[in-house]
């Protein structure tokens, strides 16, 4: 057995997510490295006051830490910094963004890679540059979506070691030529960008050369601007049931969402015998509510020991700044008898219940539903 | 019936690593959220890990972040937990648990295996 | 992180008496409170959820009650197999999920 009854109505506040939290980058530094972290605010809209933590402990701002909303920067790192780093919101300690820190005695490309592309003696007494792990230089075309890291790479050797720089859209390229900075791992033969963004978009080239001579690549960065959408409902849930008088339902519904959304468990209900009110609007009552905090959400709506006015029409609606997306289904509760007849029915028909998909935009509901409170309603029976 | 069978446990020194494992039946496994919790000797619960029903959203405490990793497998109606860089404070029982919804409690749990860290 | 304040830590009373154990969010949480049972050397057992509904095949001596900071769990008369710890969980805010620290039922 599952869980019982739930609740009439459960409210959340709503909360600001910035990036998920599940989202955890894992950055590895070198020893004498600046560490920089970039937290930009969700969805591109105001951060508000924030506080940087490590390990569970609020950073002091300091000569070599260097703290501010949406960024902190730790200079000339050691062992010691090695931790985990969050921004959160100040009032609520919301976590807006999540860092794993590894600070080891040896520069480092900041991924898990680390050390697999550094120069090697190949016993060669000289030689041009070669690329020493071409297959890895494959993908030219790169487009990530904004706020994301970009490593470019290309590692080589050659006797004497040498030299990488790098151009962008075939002109020499440093730090402050962007918002954010560089970072340039001469070791590992690359070009870090953090939290891109659409001028970052262009051509980069790796320029790799010593006295023999000179080779280069170039990969392409696309920065993907992303278009926040309303909520989607995973196709056939919940599905349509029918269930035996007293025994217990339970639905599914599963919400994705980029920006926080509202879901309810709705129920059309009758006002003094009418499903509609004045304006036609159908009436409805709140089962459960809340404010989810993921990307992706599992909800469930349990009724126990249902009686035939469970019976009706549903709603799983979910609800973000930029529309709604909502599916209905029914319940249907029969006697014992009748309900086994209509499950063989369902069988040979090949699943008889199972709802089609319907995604409705805030357009085309035509106007709110009226929602109904308990008192409002007429002999209306909820568990 | 809902089932859920944790295995891997054992003796292991401070730095070394080890894979749990959940085997899960009497329910649709793809369909439900999954979460690690621990408890240490004569201590109180400690939830560690969260999966989302797809993989693709997970979640960890402070406590074990950046040195356990959780994953699932719905073709084997599984749940793993990789464990490395060990500790003596990681020693307890872990606990392999059915989240009921986003919102819900943890309505099933397995019997618990117990990792014990020592040199 | 929110966290679960369980009071008493430990309580020690006979069979039939009624029981109350309560737990402190230090934050409003709603009504997303869940209580869990463990007996020694097994593993817990959710007893409610949402602050007040009883889960399935948990006896009906077993109430809880409450929501935003204040929760209380009750046992209306104490029978033998009741003695136990006892947690409190909240699944308002996640992550982390949090635990009271937990109440030790114990036979006077």
């Known amino acids: 057995e599952s869980l019982g009854t739930e609740q009439r109505v459960v409210g959340r506040v709503a909360e600001v997510s910035g990036p998920e939290p599940s989202q955890q980058e894992q950055l590895v530094f070198g020893s004498g490295d600046a560490v920089e972290l970039s937290c930009p605010p969700p969805g591109g809209g105001p951060m508000g006051p924030t506080v940087w933590v490590k390990d569970g402990a609020g950073l002091v701002p300091s000569e070599r830490v260097l703290v501010g909303p949406q960024r902190l920067q730790v200079l000339n790192a050691s062992h010691e910094d090695s931790g985990a780093y969050s921004c959160r919101q100040r009032l609520t300690q919301l976590v807006l963004c999540h860092f794993s820190v590894r600070v080891t005695d040896a520069p480092s490309s900041g991924d898990d890679e680390d050390g697999e592309d550094e120069a090697e003696d190949t016993g060669v007494d000289t030689g041009a540059p070669y690329w020493t792990r071409p297959e890895r230089m494959d993908k030219k075309l790169l487009a990530v979506p904004a706020a994301n890291t970009v490593r470019f790479r290309c590692p080589a050797a050659g006797n004497p070691t040498p030299s990488i720089s790098w151009l962008k859209n075939g002109k020499e390229f440093r730090g402050e030529h962007r918002i954010g900075g560089i970072k340039l791992r001469h070791q590992q033969w690359s070009l870090v960008m953090e939290s891109v963004v659409p001028s970052d978009r262009g051509n980069y080239t790796c320029v790799v050369e010593n006295k023999f001579g000179s080779i280069r690549q170039t990969y392409t960065l696309d920065v993907l601007e992303r278009s926040p959408h309303r909520p989607i409902l995973q196709a056939g849930l919940p599905a349509n049931q029918t269930a035996v008088l007293g025994s217990d339902v339970e639905f599914h519904c599963k919400v994705y969402s980029d920006a926080q959304p509202h879901i309810q468990w709705l129920k059309h209900v009758e006002v003094n015998g009418s499903k509609v009110g004045p304006d036609g609007t159908p009436y409805v009552t709140v089962l459960k509510s809340w404010i989810s905090e993921s990307v992706e959400a599992d909800v469930r709506l349990r009724l126990a020991n249902v009686s035939e006015r469970d019976g009706g029409e549903y709603l799983c609606r979910a609800t973000n700044f930029i529309g709604v997306a909502e599916k209905a289904f029914w319940l249907s509760v029969h006697g014992p008898r009748a309900a086994e007849e209509e499950l063989v029915e369902a069988d040979e028909a090949g699943s008889v219940y199972a709802g089609e998909q319907k995604l409705i935009s805030e357009e085309d509901l035509g106007g709110e539903q009226k929602l109904i409170s308990e008192e409002d309603l007429h002999h209306h029976h909820h568990h | 019936e809902v089932q859920l069978v944790e295995s891997g446990g054992g003796l292991v020194q401070p730095g070394g690593s080890l894979r749990l494992s959940c085997i899960v039946s009497?329910?649709?496994?793809?369909?439900?959220?999954m979460s690690w919790l621990r408890q240490a000797p004569g201590k109180g619960l400690e939830w560690i890990s969260y999966?989302?029903?797809?993989?693709?959203?997970?979640y960890y405490a402070d406590s074990v972040k950046g040195r356990f990793t959780i994953s699932r497998d719905s073709a084997k109606n599984s749940l793993y937990l990789e464990m490395n860089s060990l500790r003596a404070e990681d020693t307890a029982i872990y606990y392999c648990?059915?989240?009921?919804?986003?919102?819900?409690?943890?309505?099933?749990w397995g019997q618990g295996t117990l990792v014990t860290v020592s040199s | 992180d929110i966290q679960m304040t369980q009071s008493p830590s430990s309580l020690s009373a006979s069979v039939g008496d009624r029981v109350t154990i309560t737990c402190r969010a230090s934050?409003?949480?709603?009504?997303?409170l869940n209580w869990y049972q463990q007996k020694p050397g097994k593993a817990p057992k959710l007893l409610i959820y949402?602050?007040?509904s009883l889960q399935s095949g948990v006896p009906s001596r077993f109430s809880g009650s409450g929501s935003g900071t204040d929760f209380t769990l009750t046992i209306s008369s104490l029978q033998p197999e009741d003695f136990a710890t006892y947690y409190c969980?909240?699944?308002?805010?996640?992550?982390?999920?949090?635990f009271g620290q937990g109440t030790r039922l114990e036979i006077k």
């Open positions: 934050q409003s949480i709603s009504s997303y």
């Open positions: 969980q909240q699944s308002y805010s996640t992550p982390p999920i949090t």
């Open positions: 949402a602050a007040s």
């Open positions: 999966i989302s029903s797809s993989g693709r959203v997970i």
């Open positions: 009497g329910f649709i496994f793809s369909s439900y959220e």
């Open positions: 648990t059915r989240k009921w919804d986003s919102s819900g409690p943890f309505d099933f």
